[in-house]
Each structure stands twice: as structure tokens, then as C-alpha cells.
Interface confidence: low
């Protein structure tokens, strides 16, 4: 699982891996926001989120080390599309609270809470340059997390954060086909907290998908699914308060 | 080429405010963040926190929360740190620096700004 | 907050020397290390990202290691240009911090 890329690169070919140093490495923020292993989210960098950007107010201590803080519940009627913060793929323009189907910009879930586990649908599949935003909260003492993006009864990338395999935290990224799965490719970069606010971003690249966690850069997978028209459902599931699964063009 | 031109040195009083801009070029200013960097005379590098180029967003460390403040004026690609009432100890050198591809790592520097403050 | 602990804080050498010089990080930093150069009244320039990754333009003779908590940049055959003070720096989590730096000088 490479960690090499950039929206700039993905949107010029340029082949800059980070550009808002997705802080690291896609988009506009430092990758360390807060929360590899071994570190815990620093409480003591709160910021400040954009006017306008997350409705609703962070609670106290909401991942306050990544750029902008998280919210609370949005306000009521309020159906966030991605976060305009410090995201790895900042979206062309400026980002929008919009509508669960806006005529353009992001697609997904009205702001939650959604019950877990949640099926997003994808109508169409997947294609290049879509990003798939999701933002939530890790519950306390979690065990996992999966995101599984299915072709029918296949899952072309699942994407599963353990919090505790044998005394270790670990993501392992993994395709079924025909209910057998194939070989896991692991990464021990683990940037999810038990009880901690997040951000997962999913770039569809034409050749993998880009993974990006509290805006930084955190691995690629191939496609082993290569009919992406027909990846059409997003399942989430596992250990967390989901507060929004939405889409976007980029 | 990748280039952060930073505005020239300062002499302050202790109290006066000082605002030093850095001005980058050779790249799109809002895909990369961009931090701020002090260096006392004859000291090592201290990181000063860094403002979200898309989003405006600053983040300050611990130590320059107050009065700090980092802004931009994305039509000029253009960074700027803002010191407010300031102290002797804020005698230094200021960097800016872009965030590069990779986690945490900031891969082209301003040529610095020195600030001296002196009654 | 993560500390980084730069050793030795100077060191002399002779030209075509290899010289070594370690960072060590109070907790596991993963691979999220950088190295930069500072030679005397000049700016910090990047060498090396993500711990062993050199930076465009960087000469090979500069190499880096590690992961953890324990990483090293070594420069093999010593040049004059390489006289200047050396900083790591994690990236692993706010605040990002600096190691105190090694000055290197020629014997």
C-alpha cells in the first residue's frame, strides 16, 4: 500500500503526492493531525473552523489537533456535505453545507446520526476523481471499523481498522470475490482513537483507491475490482457514531 | 521554482505589533498549508503552528497562542504572521515554510525574516 | 507533546569522512521523520522525508533510517558544502517538534 500522491497530482498528473501536505499528504493540512500510533490527539490545538464550515458546535475537545474541529451534532435541518476543513482533497471552489442531493456538489446521507451499520448507495459506481467522505466518531473501547464498497455480493476494497488483533492496532485492506477473500495488505499507521471524532476520505484514482484519515494521506489500494461502474453500495459498519456519508466530484 | 519571499527585517519596540508576509510562487498556494517557524539567535527551530491555505484556518502551538495570528490573502498567495504587543524574547528570526507531500514534512522555506525588538 | 532528542549536539569530521547522526523520538513516531539543513546564516532546507525518502535535488551521499522511535541520518564522503547544523523533526502528531541540532564542523 503506497502513500504516494496528491490532489494536485491526481487532478495534474504532476505526481506531487501531497499537496496541502494531505499534512501531509493530500490537501491542505499537515498529515500528524493528530493521532498515529502512540500519539494521542492533542488537546491543546483547538483552532478554529471556518465560518460557516461545520454547522453545529464541536464538543469540547473534538479532535482539536487536526485542522478545524469536528462538530457536534449539525444544527437541525443542517445536511453538511464533506467538511470544508483542512481536507486532504479540497474540492475545486468553495466547499458547501448543501442538501442531500443538491443539483451539484456533495451526495450522501442527511447529517446524522445514521444508524451503523449504513449502507450508502452509489448509483453509477464509482468513478475517477470521486471522493467519498465520511465523519464520525470513534466509540469507546472500540474493536472495528469496515468500510466495504460491494459490487453486488463482492466487496471490492474492504478497508478494516482493528483496534485490538493480538495486542495490536492494525488496517487491513482486503477484496472478496465469490465469498473468498484474497490476500490482506496491512498497514500499521493507525490513526483512528477509541471515543475520537474523524474524518475518512476515499479518492477513487483510476488504477486504487486513495485513503485519507483526519486529512492525511494514509494508503492506496489497487483495484482488484476493475468494473468500477458496478462498485454500488458503500456498507459501514463497526465501532463508531456515524455522523455523515456523503460525495463529491473533484 | 517553488519560492516563499518573505518580507524584509524589523525593528520594533517592545508593545508596537509587527506583520511579516511571505509570498509563494511556482505552485498552487491553496493546496499546501503553510507554517510558520522561529528561530531565536543561536538557537534551534521552533515550530509555531501553521494556517490551512483553503480553508483559512490557523493552528497555533501552545506557546504562540494569543498573541500570534497567522492570515492570508489567497488572491496574492500570500502568508502572513502578525506579532501583537511585542517582547523582547520575540527577537528573532521567522521562517515560513510549505507543507510538502509527505506527513508533516516542509519542503521549501522562506529566506526569514528577522524581527529585532528593542526599546 | 513529543520530543525529539538530537545526539551528538556537534561534531568534527574530515572531509570524506561518514559521519552519523541520530534522532530519538519519546514515542513512536512511526516513519513520519524529516531532516533539514541549515548551513550558517542560511535557511533550513529539506533533505529527507518520511525518514529515508531524499528530497529533490538532495545528493545521494545523504541518506536516512529508521522508525519508531530511533532514526539516523548518515552522510557518507564528506563535502565542504556539507558544514552546516542538522535538524530532525517529527511529524507524527501536534505539536510538531524539532530535535536541538547537530552542529558539524571540519576537523
Known amino acids: 500500500m503506497a502513500d504516494n500522491f496528491s490532489l494536485h497530482d491526481a487532478l495534474s498528473g504532476s505526481g506531487n503526492p501531497n499537496p496541502q501536505g494531505w499534512p501531509g499528504a493530500w490537501g491542505n493540512q499537515p498529515a500528524g493531525a493528530g493521532g498515529y500510533p502512540g500519539a494521542s490527539y492533542p488537546g491543546a490545538y483547538p483552532g478554529q473552523a471556518p465560518p460557516g464550515a461545520y454547522p453545529g458546535q464541536a464538543p469540547p475537545g473534538a479532535y482539536p489537533g487536526a485542522p478545524g474541529a469536528y462538530p457536534g451534532a449539525p444544527a437541525p435541518g443542517v445536511y453538511p456535505g464533506p467538511p470544508s476543513g483542512p481536507g486532504a482533497y479540497p474540492s475545486s471552489g468553495q466547499p458547501s453545507a448543501t442538501g442531500a442531493y443538491p443539483a451539484t456538489g456533495p451526495y450522501g446521507a442527511p447529517a446524522g446520526p445514521l444508524i451503523v451499520p449504513y449502507n450508502l448507495p452509489l448509483p453509477g459506481g464509482v468513478v475517477p476523481r470521486m471522493l467519498i467522505t465520511i465523519l464520525g466518531t470513534v466509540k469507546p473501547n472500540a474493536n472495528r471499523i469496515a468500510l466495504d464498497f460491494q459490487r453486488g455480493n463482492d466487496v471490492a476494497f474492504h478497508f478494516n481498522p482493528r483496534f485490538n488483533e493480538n495486542n495490536r492496532r492494525v488496517i487491513v485492506c482486503n477484496t472478496k470475490l465469490d465469498n473468498n477473500w484474497g490476500r490482506e495488505e496491512r498497514q500499521s499507521v493507525f490513526p483512528f482513537e477509541s471515543g475520537k471524532p474523524f474524518k475518512i476520505q476515499v479518492l477513487v484514482e483510476p488504477d486504487h483507491f486513495k485513503v485519507a484519515v483526519n486529512d492525511a494521506h494514509l494508503l492506496q489500494y489497487n483495484h482488484r475490482v476493475k468494473k468500477l461502474n458496478e462498485i454500488s453500495k458503500l456498507g459501514i459498519s463497526g465501532d463508531i457514531d456515524l455522523t455523515s456519508a456523503s460525495y463529491t466530484m473533484i | 521554482q517553488i519560492q516563499l519571499v518573505q518580507s524584509g527585517p524589523e525593528v520594533k519596540k517592545p508593545g508596537e505589533t509587527v506583520k511579516i508576509s511571505c509570498k509563494a510562487s511556482g505552485y498552487i498556494f491553496t493546496n499546501y498549508g503553510m507554517n510558520w517557524v522561529k528561530q531565536a539567535p543561536g538557537k534551534g527551530l521552533k515550530w509555531m503552528g501553521w494556517?490551512?491555505?483553503?480553508?483559512?484556518?490557523?493552528t497555533y502551538t501552545d506557546d504562540f497562542k494569543g498573541r500570534f495570528a497567522f492570515s492570508l490573502e489567497t488572491s496574492a498567495s500570500t502568508a502572513y504572521l502578525q506579532i501583537n504587543n511585542l517582547k523582547n524574547e520575540d527577537t528573532a528570526t521567522y521562517f515560513c515554510a510549505k507543507f510538502g507531500n509527505y506527513v508533516g514534512a516542509m519542503d521549501y522555506w522562506g529566506q526569514g525574516t528577522s524581527v529585532t525588538v528593542s526599546s | 507533546e513529543i520530543k525529539m532528542n538530537q545526539s551528538p549536539s556537534s561534531l568534527s569530521a574530515s572531509l570524506g569522512d561518514t559521519i552519523t547522526i541520530t534522532c530519538h523520538a519519546s514515542q513512536n513516531i512511526n516513519v513520519w521523520l524529516s531532516w533539514y539543513q541549515q548551513k550558517p546564516g542560511n535557511i533550513p532546507k529539506l533533505l529527507i522525508y518520511?525518514?529515508?525518502n531524499l528530497h529533490t535535488g538532495v545528493p545521494s551521499r545523504f541518506s536516512g533510517s529508521g522508525s519508531g522511535t530511533g532514526f539516523t541520518l548518515t552522510i557518507s564522503s564528506l563535502q565542504p558544502e556539507d558544514i552546516a547544523t542538522y535538524y530532525c523533526q517529527q511529524g507524527q502528531s501536534y505539536p510538531y517538534t524539532f530535535g536541538g541540532g547537530t552542529k558539524l564542523e571540519l576537523k
Open positions: 518520511k525518514a529515508s
Open positions: 494556517i490551512n491555505t483553503y480553508t483559512g484556518e490557523p
